[in-house]
Interface confidence: low
């Protein structure tokens, strides 16, 4: 016989005995020669034991790749498969040899005085008792004890195979302590070794209750509890339940085995406890215990029984939530109820839907809270059975740490002309409004020239010795105005102003605003120069495509070599001792500009013209002048802001209105845009002309119609136009009542 897969054009080894089965008598010599095409080896029964001392494998004298296996005086135990194979391949030829030994028909396992057979009590499982035969056609039966029982092959599920042993359904011998095979030859009985029978299977892996927790019902509802035990194979399970009300009419227990996937190494048992109509006395702990005899496991769950469905808010439900801008806000809906309620959140009456910024569920989560999230949030709980509703309002207040508006707008290097009066401003936005805004100051040189202090672009003022503005000894005379409150860009802001009555010394001023959630501060570099002076003509803030001139005026007797520069886009590298106007010392960062020089009796005026100003022209412009005597350079810096052109828009709508004859109508039309748009009014698409009854004020923003008449009824249009286009709004005015004829008409 041949086994294995064919390899690269190799023929199977060829045996000298061309049979699958060879039967020989005991005490004779077994000799088989094997020839092949590469190195060969032999395998024989029990060749891992000491018996190989009797087995001889020799090279053939007549050729390469040939080996002869010889066993003199064979015995029954030499029965088995003899295999010749190519080394390191699966290619082999096999012959099964029976050594007929009628005195010892069963092959004995060399080391075993007795064997062990492990069985499970599965009806479908068979077990093989490995009593192999040295004779192929024996009559073999299986003896089990105690009590003694004999099993004879039935041609079906009970059989004996000389190469395999005795096969029998395992449940048939699960009662037995031991088994052995017996053969009858010429009225003589021969027995195999004894095999001890071990029945396996007792482990319970786990016991799981379903539902596992949080079971709530109301009186009259059905309770169904499932208890599942997972075990190893061939385990029998007994279930035991403990529950509050043992005298229950409507209690039902059903136990069954669950089907598991074929090939599964696990068994499942299920016990189901059903109570059709629960009462309050059924509330309590339910315990399911599963026992396999050698092992018990249990699990418990608590069942709560309510009188009826209900919903209510828990005591921990908040009414006020405070947060700071940017924080994550979590408002949990804390409730008691059965069954769990449907939860809906509303903000200022509008339902909230979940998205990437807000999650509206059991917990209302605002990922990164902003001011616009301030408001009243209503959570409505609805009981899905009774439809009972409960609502609760949570006020969310979002706080904003003080933010100082000018911080990002003002150039840190603006200069101020010696002797002038100047006003410094801090416009603070904070929620709640700042409880104080304090001003501090210190001399510029005290701050800028301390070499031990590290100075960085992010923190250009490392000095700590700030003085209160009340103490202006050695500095400029200061007056702090009372805080003003202004509505700017739709926000209530606090404006604090500091008046420097005469700019005599260079200093740093700091305003500090504090509210309950934070603080903000702005440091203003107040560099006083006796040098050139910059003015803008015609406007401080030109709009795109307008022209603007920057004038640098210097006393001709003191200064010479006036030059215009523009600061590059990179922030200046700031070095110790160069604060806060280092531009004169670092001309590499400046771009020289073309300019025109004019003179009058006392001054030189260097004019740099920007025709059709663009947003790219924004930035810091530097006028440099040199002292005629000392040759020291003086720089003045002015920040130029160019306003973007914006097409007209009209804020707010005109409302249709009905008015009685003789009354007045007042409407306003607020337009914005850059350049500022012109406002015109139309009635029924005709230009509205002012007369004694029709008055236009505030650049046509406000329209008043006094003592209205029937003929004032119609379609009124407000139109705001600039070079960038027009915007309009319309409203229909209905005039009611009969016209009174008067002499005044």
């Amino acid at each position: 016989a041949s086994v294995g897969l064919p390899s690269v054009s190799l023929d199977l080894p060829r045996l000298s005995i061309q049979k699958d089965i060879l039967t020989i008598k005991a005490n004779t010599t077994l000799q088989i020669t094997c020839r092949g095409q590469r190195d060969l080896d032999w395998l024989w029964p029990n060749n891992q034991s000491g018996s190989e001392q009797r087995v001889e494998v020799t090279e053939c004298s007549d050729g390469l790749f040939c080996k002869t296996l010889t066993i003199p005086k064979v015995i029954g135990n030499d029965t088995g498969a003899y295999k010749c194979f190519y080394r390191e391949t699966d290619l082999a030829s096999v012959i099964y040899v029976y050594v007929q030994d009628y005195r010892s028909p069963f092959i004995a396992s060399v080391s075993d005085q007795h064997g062990v057979v492990y069985i499970t009590e599965n009806k479908n499982k068979t077990v093989v008792i490995p009593c192999l035969g040295s004779i192929s056609n024996l009559n073999v039966s299986l003896c089990a004890r105690y009590p003694e029982k004999r099993f004879v092959p039935d041609g079906n599920r009970i059989s004996w195979d000389s190469k395999k042993g005795f096969t029998i359904p395992s449940y048939m011998i699960s009662y037995a302590g031991m088994v052995f095979c017996e053969a009858k030859i010429n009225d003589e009985s021969y027995q195999s070794i004894m095999y001890i029978v071990v029945v396996v299977g007792y482990r319970i892996y786990d016991v799981v209750l379903s539902p596992s927790h949080g079971i709530e019902l109301s009186v009259g509802e059905k309770l169904v509890l499932n208890c599942t035990a997972r075990t190893e194979l061939n385990v029998g399970i007994d279930f035991n339940w403990e529950y509050p009300s043992s005298k229950h009419q409507h209690k039902k227990l059903v136990n069954r085995d669950l089907k598991t996937q074929s090939g599964s190494e696990m068994k499942k048992f299920l016990s189901t406890l059903t109570i059709d109509g629960v009462t309050r006395s059924d509330q309590g702990l339910y315990t399911c215990a599963a026992s396999s005899g050698l092992m018990t496991k249990k699990n418990s769950t608590f069942v709560r029984v309510h009188e009826k469905p209900f919903v209510a808010f828990g005591s921990g439900m908040e009414s006020l939530v405070e947060a700071t801008v940017g924080e994550r806000v979590r408002i949990p809906a804390k409730y008691l109820g059965y069954p769990p309620p449907e939860i809906k959140w509303y903000k200022n009456g509008i339902p909230l839907e979940s998205n990437h910024t807000i999650k509206a569920g059991h917990v209302l989560t605002i990922m990164e809270v902003s001011e616009r999230d301030t408001g009243n949030y209503t959570v409505i709980l609805t009981n899905p059975i009774s439809k009972e509703k409960q609502s609760h309002v949570v006020s969310l207040v979002v706080y904003v740490p003080p933010q100082i508006g000018e911080k990002s707008l003002i150039s840190p290097v603006d200069s101020y002309q010696y002797g002038t009066t100047q006003t410094l401003t801090c416009t603070v936005y904070a929620i709640p409004p700042p409880h104080h805004i304090h001003w501090y100051w210190q001399l510029e040189e005290e701050c800028a020239n301390e070499p031990s202090q590290a100075v960085s672009v992010t923190n250009p003022y490392p000095c700590e010795e700030w003085r209160s503005v009340e103490d202006f000894q050695g500095g400029n005379k200061i007056e702090v105005n009372k805080n003003q409150f202004a509505l700017i860009e739709g926000k209530n802001k606090t404006v604090s102003t500091l008046v420097i009555q005469a700019a005599n010394v260079s200093a740093l001023y700091k305003c500090e605003a504090v509210n309950k959630v934070g603080r903000g501060e702005r440091v203003i570099s107040f560099h006083v120069t006796r040098g050139p002076e910059i003015t803008l003509q015609p406007d401080m803030q030109p709009t795109e495509q307008e022209s603007v001139s920057l004038w640098c005026t210097a006393d001709r007797s003191t200064f010479e070599n006036l030059t215009w520069y523009k600061l590059g886009p990179q922030p200046l590298p700031i070095h110790v001792g160069e604060l806060p106007t280092p531009v004169c010392k670092n001309l590499d960062t400046l771009w020289k500009l073309n300019a025109t020089m004019f003179s009058n009796s006392t001054n030189d005026i260097l004019i740099m013209e920007l025709k059709n100003a663009s947003l790219q022209d924004q930035g810091d412009y530097v006028c440099l002048a040199q002292d005629r005597k000392t040759k020291k350079r003086h720089c003045v810096v002015r920040q130029l802001t160019v306003l973007e052109r914006v097409a007209p828009t009209i804020t707010g709508n005109l409302e249709n209105q009905t008015t009685s004859i003789g009354e007045s109508i007042e409407v306003s039309c607020t337009a914005s845009g850059n350049p500022p748009p012109q406002i015109m009014w139309f009635k029924d698409n005709e230009t509205l002309v002012e007369d004694s009854g029709i008055v236009l004020k505030d650049g046509n923003r406000n329209l008043t119609i006094r003592r209205v008449r029937k003929e004032d009824e119609g379609l009124y249009t407000c139109q705001a136009c600039s070079v960038l286009g027009c915007a309009k709004v319309e409203a229909f005015f209905i005039i009611e009542g009969a016209q009174e004829k008067t002499n005044l008409e």
């Epitope: 990164e368 740490p401 933010q403 911080k407 959630v517």
Partner: nanobody, 121 residues
């Protein structure tokens, strides 16, 4: 939401310097106070340095005053810790954190994963 990623940690000899960086992604970085915390094995997390959202006020633990400098660059959404004259007791995992108030660790909302600093003697 703000995500924070620290870098710049490593092994350095006593007396040496390191500069830790913390890059932030997400909106409104400039409205957060930023802090550097550290945690040595078996010790509690401590605040080393902090800088206010407007970068005008800073805080330093006594153990690092004069040696460490915290700074921020709102344009780059980054905060830095310059560590000079390092000592073996500065060995720890350094964390960058963001919040609205300066000094209370429990009030820092967002945290980085941390970067290891080891100072050998």
């Amino acid at each position: 939401q703000v995500q924070l990623v620290e870098s710049g940690g490593g092994l350095v000899q006593a007396g040496g310097s390191l500069r830790l960086s913390c890059a932030a992604s997400g909106r409104a970085f400039s409205s957060y106070a930023m802090g550097w915390f550290r945690q040595a094995p078996g010790k509690e997390r401590e605040l080393v340095a902090a800088i206010s959202w407007s970068d005008d006020s800073t805080y330093y633990a006594n153990s690092v005053k004069g040696r460490f400098t915290i700074s921020r660059d709102n344009a780059k959404s980054a905060v830095y810790l310059q560590m000079n004259s390092l000592k073996p007791e500065d060995t720890a995992v350094y964390y960058c954190a963001a919040h609205k108030s300066l000094q209370r660790p429990d009030e820092y909302t967002y945290w980085g994963q941390g970067t290891q600093v080891t100072v050998s003697s």
